[in-house]
């Protein structure tokens, strides 16, 4: 079978600072040198692209400067971090991996990681 399998955790809880990290791992059917990773958010049947990065194997992932994502890669594993999350950003975050070069191209889409974001309670005013 030449399909590419992508694995990611089912659930992740964002930190109180609105940061969530998870690992996206793919079983590569070929020897890719260039890989593209995209994070998609699915909520209420709407799908939006959160961020995307293309990297050369052995090099770091480079997201756009204004991206809310950062990441590192190690072999067939990508460690993704999404920051600036609020409660309204709770949803299913899907890892999409594409082996871009050399041909043939392969597509792999994970089942998604449900990220729960809880806005921190505001600190009560204290009178001293």
């Amino acid at each position: 079978c030449k399909a590419m399998h992508v694995a990611q955790p089912a659930v992740v809880l964002a930190s109180s600072r609105g940061i969530a990290s998870f690992v996206c791992e793919y079983a590569s059917p070929g020897k890719a040198t260039e890989v593209r990773v995209t994070v998609l958010r699915q909520a209420d049947s709407q799908v939006t692209e959160v961020c995307a990065a293309t990297y050369m194997m052995g090099n770091e992932l480079t997201f756009l400067d204004d991206s809310i994502c950062t990441g590192t890669s190690s072999g067939n594993q990508v460690n993704l971090t999404i920051q600036g999350l609020r409660a309204m950003d709770t949803g299913l975050y899907i890892c999409k991996v594409e082996l871009m070069y050399p041909p043939p191209y392969y597509l792999g889409i994970g089942n998604g990681t449900q990220i729960y974001v809880i806005d921190p309670e505001p600190c009560p005013d204290s009178d001293f």
């Epitope: 079978c1 030449k2 590419m4 593209r36 998609l40 799908v47 692209e49 597509l107």
Partner: antibody, heavy 118, light 108 residues
Framework: QVQLVESGGGVVQPGRSLRLSCAAS????????MHWVRQAPGKGLEWVAV????????HYADSVKGRFTISRDNSKNTLYLQMNSLRAEDTAVYYC???????????WGQGTLVTVSS | EIVLTQSPGTLSLSPGERATLSCRAS???????LAWYQQKPGQAPRLLIY???SRATGIPDRFSGSGSGTDFTLTISRLEPEDFAVYYC?????????FGPGTKVDIK
């Protein structure tokens, strides 16, 4: 809304060249993989070529490799297919197609007919 | 290259009947990457089903897809007059992206 409009088709002699264009609107070309798919008269669909995202990667069907070149102009939001050394078997309707977020072919143009005949 | 075979080549049915179209792959296709398209004469193909079973935007629920591995099915639960057309399956999980030869659904 998403719209793809092909142009540039016509009748051409074997061995000659032709360039097809596809004007895209309603989305940004560089955010998607863009494909050309063709259909010979009375036949099925055949994938021809794809250009990925930033344009640095292009993949071709074996039947057109070395003869066809896919490209795009992001400033014009336009996709191209340069077809050289045309053969009779290249006669087909050529469709410009957007690769959707899930990888499927979600939007198709109306097609442009290319006839290679002497 | 993944070769897709569709059967039957032609399906003759009456409006209101159920249509079952088959698509078989030469090697396993992850169900995430199998699509069905409808094409009417003189028109471009239209995406019906992707991921083997997910309906595309605006597609009526009489169209459904199923299957996994090498065997996939498109079912039209109750044929409407506008459903008589050619249907193609396609795998988009690896290049070259391949289509089946099509099944023509015509009026009996």
């Amino acid at each position: 809304q998403v719209q793809l409009v092909e142009s540039g088709g016509g009748v051409v002699q074997p061995g000659r060249s032709l360039r097809l264009s596809c004007a895209a609107s309603g989305f940004t070309l560089s955010s998607y993989g863009m494909h050309w798919v063709r259909q010979a008269p009375g036949k099925g669909l055949e994938w021809v070529a794809v250009i990925w995202y930033d344009g640095s990667n292009k993949h071709y069907a074996d039947s057109v490799k070395g003869r066809f070149t896919i490209s795009r102009d992001n400033s014009k939001n336009t996709l191209y297919l340069q077809m050289n050394s045309l053969r009779a078997e290249d006669t087909a309707v050529y469709y410009c197609v957007r690769g959707g977020i899930w990888g499927n072919f979600d939007y198709w143009g109306q097609g442009t007919l290319v006839t290679v005949s002497s | 290259e993944i070769v897709l075979t569709q059967s039957p080549g032609t399906l003759s049915l009456s409006p209101g009947e159920r249509a079952t179209l088959s698509c078989r792959a030469s090697q396993s296709v992850s169900s995430n990457y199998l699509a069905w398209y409808q094409q009417k004469p003189g028109q471009a193909p239209r995406l019906l089903i992707y991921g083997a079973s997910s309906r595309a935007t605006g597609i009526p629920d009489r169209f459904s897809g199923s299957g996994s591995g090498t065997d996939f099915t498109l079912t039209i639960s109750r044929l409407e007059p506008e459903d008589f057309a050619v249907y193609y399956c396609q795998q988009y999980g690896s290049s070259p992206f391949t289509f089946g030869p099509g099944t023509k659904v015509d009026i009996k």
